[in-house]
Amino acid sequence: LQDLCSNCPAGTFCDNNRSQICSPCPPNSFSSAGGQRTCDICRQCKGVFKTRKECSSTSNAECDCISGYHCLGAECSMCEQDCKQGQELTKKGCKDCCFGTFNDQKRGICRPWTNCSLDGKSVLVNGTKERDVVCGPSPADLSPGASSATPPAPAREPGHSPQ
């Protein structure tokens, strides 16, 4: 009897009520593997979720988040509010990155600017709330025999535009 069920392909289930005949999954259900005793209920993408891939008899629906939100967790199990670049999401909503930190995405947290001097490098482009610092070649005083005229500016001064 077990062998009969193992013959049931994906998209069907082994119907015990019908002498283990392979029956198609009912509407809004699926089985992604063969030999299933039941079909699983299709996921419904509602509210902040939107359908990325419709449910079929052999595969579950896949959800995305509506505009202004992004997926979190395996298989987009949650939607989290987007913020702007240069911000991070806190309990009180979206807040600008503090001085010395940046976020170049609509999600995630603000991260500290790269400290170029830790690697003995100069600053080519200053950091902003939206962008990390860009480091460049080692300045003269850190590179024997090298030559520069003006030392690199500090990473960024408040109110200054990006370098």
Epitope: S122, V123, L124, C135, G136, P152, S161
Partner: antibody, heavy 122, light 107 residues
Framework: EVHLLESGGGLVQPGGSLRLSCAAS????????MGWVRQAPGKGLEWVSI????????YYADSVKGRFTISRDNSKNTLYLQMNSLRAEDTAVYYC???????????????WGQGTLVTVSS | DIQMTQSPSSLSASIGDRVAITCRAS??????LAWFQQKPGKAPKSLIY???SLQSGVPSKFSGSGSGTDFTLTISSLQPEDFATYYC?????????FGGGTKVEIK
């Protein structure tokens, strides 16, 4: 598409001055360091100077230090090279170039302008 | 200053040949090395940065390798448009320095 157009080259006498300009378009000018590289006739490439995105950091080759000044006007998307006390050995094609970076590090040149010829001769 | 020594200074090759150009730094520069191609009367064009990363739009027949002091630019199958002069540049430290160039000519 990034476009860099140099101007201001020409013939100048030894000891004279010249100011080169480089008009930039096709990218966020203030977000990139910029530089000048020169090439004497029939010779190789020689780095001249670099300026950071906001203009706060400047670096020069020893051969031009104290004579050349690099600057930029981010509101006009323009890079400059003021050249004073010019010498015969400064004769070269001067290229303006955007400084490339990947991730958080950079320092190579990409792309380059078409160049402007500076001839220092009496 | 970091000296960049390219070899050979010139080479003759045929269409379809595999060509390798080497660049040696006088001190370690990690992978802070770029390669450029220059054709007569034209501005240099960036091919490779970070020793081995292909610049956007550059054909994959160009490849770069190396780290520290020894670097190589390889053209897997030379085509007529590849006959040019090639330069390396270190951007590990100021002053930025270029190799003396390698002229690739038709045999």
């Amino acid at each position: 598409e990034v476009h860099l157009l140099e101007s201001g080259g020409g013939l100048v006498q030894p000891g004279g001055s010249l100011r080169l300009s480089c008009a930039a378009s096709g990218f966020t000018f203030s977000s990139y360091a910029m530089g000048w590289v020169r090439q004497a006739p029939g010779k190789g490439l020689e780095w001249v100077s670099i300026i950071g995105g906001g203009g706060g950091s400047t670096y020069y080759a020893d051969s031009v230090k104290g004579r050349f000044t690099i600057s930029r006007d981010n509101s006009k998307n323009t890079l400059y090279l003021q050249m004073n006390s010019l010498r015969a050995e400064d004769t070269a094609v001067y290229y303006c170039a955007k400084v490339g970076y990947s991730g958080t590090y950079g320092g190579w040149f990409d792309p380059w302008g078409q160049g402007t010829l500076v001839t220092v001769s009496s | 200053d970091i000296q960049m020594t390219q070899s050979p200074s010139s080479l003759s090759a045929s269409i379809g040949d595999r060509v390798a150009i080497t660049c040696r730094a006088s001190q370690g520069i990690s992978n802070y090395l770029a390669w450029f191609q220059q054709k007569p009367g034209k501005a240099p064009k960036s091919l490779i940065y970070a020793a081995s990363s292909l610049q956007s739009g550059v054909p994959s027949k160009f490849s770069g390798s190396g780290s520290g002091t020894d670097f190589t630019l390889t053209i897997s199958s030379l085509q007529p448009e590849d006959f040019a002069t090639y330069y390396c540049q270190q951007y590990n430290s100021y002053p930025l320095t270029f190799g003396g160039g390698t002229k690739v000519e038709i045999k």
